[in-house]
C-alpha cells in the first residue's frame, strides 16, 4: 500500500522571501527504489483555478518549471518527496499537490500554502497643527500580508500597572496596498499631555497572522512630554 502524508492540518504558513520546504512524505511497505519512482508537484493559485506543474522527476527526466524548485533525489530514496522553493513570493500561495508513483502504484496529497509578511512597526510624533499640550502619536505598520491587521493602543500608569486599552481619540486609517502586494496602515492616538500623568507608558500593539506575539512599540510621558522607545523585538515565523 502506498500513502502520501502532507503537513498536518493541511496548511503550511511561510514568511515572504523564505526558502520554504513543502512537506510530502511517502509511506510504502517495501524499500523504495528511485529508478521506479516518480514525483510531480503541482500548484493551483488562489485566484486562478488552473493547476500548473512546478517540478517533476521520473525516469531520466527532471525539471523545475518554477526556477529553483527542487526535490532531493537522495531524500526521495528515504521517502521524503518534499519540495523546496527558494525565495517564496506572495503570489505563490495556494494549493500544492504532490503526486507520487512507486511502480505500479500512485498516490497524492494536497496542502495549502499561506505566505505571510510580518509588519514593521514604528512610532512617530506629529505636532504639526496641534494645539498646545496636544500631541498626535502615529503608529505606522508596514509591509504586512495578509491585509487583516489589528492595531490597538494601551496605557500603563503607576497607579494601574496593568495595561488598559484606549478607545477614545484613536483613529486608524485605511490599509494601503504596496507595489509588492504587502500593506501599510497608520493608527493615530491624540493625547492631551496636560491631562496625563508623567511616567505613563503608552503602547501601540500590533496583532497580525504572521506574528506569534503582538508587536509592541511604546513611549513614556515625561515632564518633558514624551520619550519614544525602540519597537520591542518579537518572534516572527521562521
Amino acid at each position: 500500500d502506498l500513502k502520501v502524508e502532507m503537513m498536518a492540518g493541511g496548511t503550511q504558513i511561510t514568511p515572504l522571501n523564505d526558502n520554504v520546504t513543502i512537506f510530502c512524505n511517502i509511506f510504502y511497505s517495501q524499500p523504495l527504489n528511485i529508478t521506479s519512482m516518480g514525483i510531480t508537484w503541482f500548484w493551483k493559485s488562489l485566484t486562478f483555478d488552473k493547476e500548473v506543474k512546478v517540478f517533476e522527476f521520473f525516469g531520466d527526466h527532471q525539471e523545475a518549471f518554477r526556477p529553483g524548485a527542487i526535490v532531493s533525489p537522495w531524500r526521495l530514496k528515504s521517502g521524503d518527496a518534499s519540495l523546496r522553493l527558494p525565495g517564496i513570493q506572495l503570489e505563490e500561495a495556494g494549493e500544492y499537490r504532490c503526486e507520487v508513483v512507486v511502480t505500479p502504484l500512485k498516490a497524492q496529497g494536497t496542502v495549502q500554502l499561506e505566505v505571510v509578511a510580518s509588519p514593521a512597526s514604528r512610532l512617530l510624533l506629529d505636532q504639526v497643527g496641534m494645539k498646545e499640550n496636544e500631541d498626535k502619536y502615529m503608529c505606522e505598520s508596514s509591509g504586512f500580508y495578509p491585509e487583516a491587521i489589528n492595531i490597538t493602543w494601551e496605557k500603563q500608569t503607576q497607579k494601574f500597572p496593568h495595561p488598559i486599552e484606549i478607545s477614545e481619540d484613536v483613529i486608524t486609517g485605511p490599509t494601503i496596498k504596496n507595489m509588492d502586494g504587502t500593506f501599510n496602515v497608520t493608527s493615530c492616538l491624540k493625547l492631551n499631555s496636560s491631562q496625563e500623568d508623567p511616567g505613563t507608558v503608552y503602547q501601540c500593539v500590533v496583532r497580525h497572522a504572521s506574528l506569534h506575539t503582538p508587536l509592541r512599540s511604546n513611549f513614556t510621558l515625561t515632564a518633558a512630554r514624551h520619550s519614544l522607545s525602540e519597537t520591542e523585538k518579537t518572534d516572527n515565523f521562521s
Epitope: G38, V52, G59, D60, F65, V101, T103, P104, K106
Partner: antibody, heavy 117, light 107 residues
Framework: QVHLQESGPGLVKPSETLSLTCTVS????????WSWIRQPAGKGLEWIGH???????NYNPSLKSRVIMSVDTSKNQFSLNLSSVTAADTAVYYC???????????WGQGTLVTVSS | DIQMTQSPSSVSASVGDRVTITCRAS??????LAWYQQKPGKAPKLLIY???SLQRGVPSRFSGSGSGTDFTLTISNLQPEDFATYYC?????????FGQGTKVEIK
C-alpha cells in the same frame, strides 16, 4: 482548453531546411515541455524531440545533427528546423504538449511536409 | 534506444468484444508508458498515461496495466468508434520511442 496549430510550407526541396511553427492557444507555453513527432505515410510515430526553453531541450539522436528547436514565449509559439532534408523526411509532422509523466496529452492536427524537387 | 514492440500488429474484432493489446519494452521502463488511439487522417489521442491512469474524458472501457517491460491495453465491450490504430510510448528515457502500432479492425 489548449489548442495547437502547426504551420509551414507543405513542400520542401531536398537539401533545404524544413521549418515549422506550432502556435499554442489556451495555455502558457512556459508551463510545459513541447514535442515534435512525425509520421511517414502508413507508418508509425517517431519522436523528433522536445523543448521547454531554448536551453532546455532533448533531440532524438538519429536526427540531432539536423534539428534545431526554439521557443518564442511572446508569441506562445515553438518551432522546428530540420536541415538537409531528403525524401525520407516526408511525413505528417505533429506538435504536441508533454503532459503528466511524459505522455503527450494534446496534439496539433498535423501538417504534411513533402520533400521533393 | 529502448525498443517498443506491440503485438499483435492487427486484430479483427466485433462490437462488444474484449480486445487486449500488449506492448513490450526492450528494457525496464517502470510505469512510464502511455497509450494512444489514432484514427485515419487524425492526430493521436492520449488514452492512458503512467501505465494505468485513464486520461480525463476517456471512456472507462479502456484500461491499462503492467510495469517493468510488459504492458497491456484492454478495451472491454468494444464500440464502433474504437476501431483505430493504437500505439504505446515509453517515457522512461530519451529518445522517447513508440511501438509500431496495433490496428483494431472490424471482423
Amino acid at each position: 482548453q489548449v489548442h495547437l496549430q502547426e504551420s509551414g510550407p507543405g513542400l520542401v526541396k531536398p537539401s533545404e531546411t524544413l521549418s515549422l511553427t506550432c502556435t499554442v492557444s489556451g495555455d502558457s507555453i512556459s508551463s510545459y515541455y513541447w514535442s515534435w513527432i512525425r509520421q511517414p505515410a502508413g507508418k508509425g510515430l517517431e519522436w523528433i524531440g522536445h523543448i521547454y526553453t531554448s536551453e532546455k531541450n532533448n533531440y532524438n539522436p538519429s536526427l540531432k545533427s539536423r534539428v534545431i528547436m526554439s521557443v518564442d514565449t511572446s508569441k506562445n509559439q515553438f518551432s522546428l528546423n530540420l536541415s538537409s532534408v531528403t525524401a525520407a523526411d516526408t511525413a505528417v509532422y505533429y506538435c504536441a504538449r508533454v503532459g503528466n509523466w511524459g505522455s503527450h496529452d494534446a496534439w496539433g492536427q498535423g501538417t504534411l511536409v513533402t520533400v521533393s524537387s | 534506444d529502448i525498443q517498443m514492440t506491440q503485438s499483435p500488429s492487427s486484430v479483427s474484432a466485433s462490437v462488444g468484444d474484449r480486445v487486449t493489446i500488449t506492448c513490450r519494452a526492450s528494457q525496464g521502463i517502470s510505469s512510464w508508458l502511455a497509450w494512444y488511439q489514432q484514427k485515419p487522417g487524425k492526430a493521436p489521442k492520449l488514452l492512458i498515461y503512467v501505465a494505468s491512469s485513464l486520461q480525463r474524458g476517456v471512456p472507462s472501457r479502456f484500461s491499462g496495466s503492467g510495469s517493468g517491460t510488459d504492458f497491456t491495453l484492454t478495451i472491454s465491450n468494444l464500440q464502433p468508434e474504437d476501431f483505430a490504430t493504437y500505439y504505446c510510448q515509453q517515457a522512461n528515457s530519451f529518445p522517447r520511442t513508440f511501438g509500431q502500432g496495433t490496428k483494431v479492425e472490424i471482423k
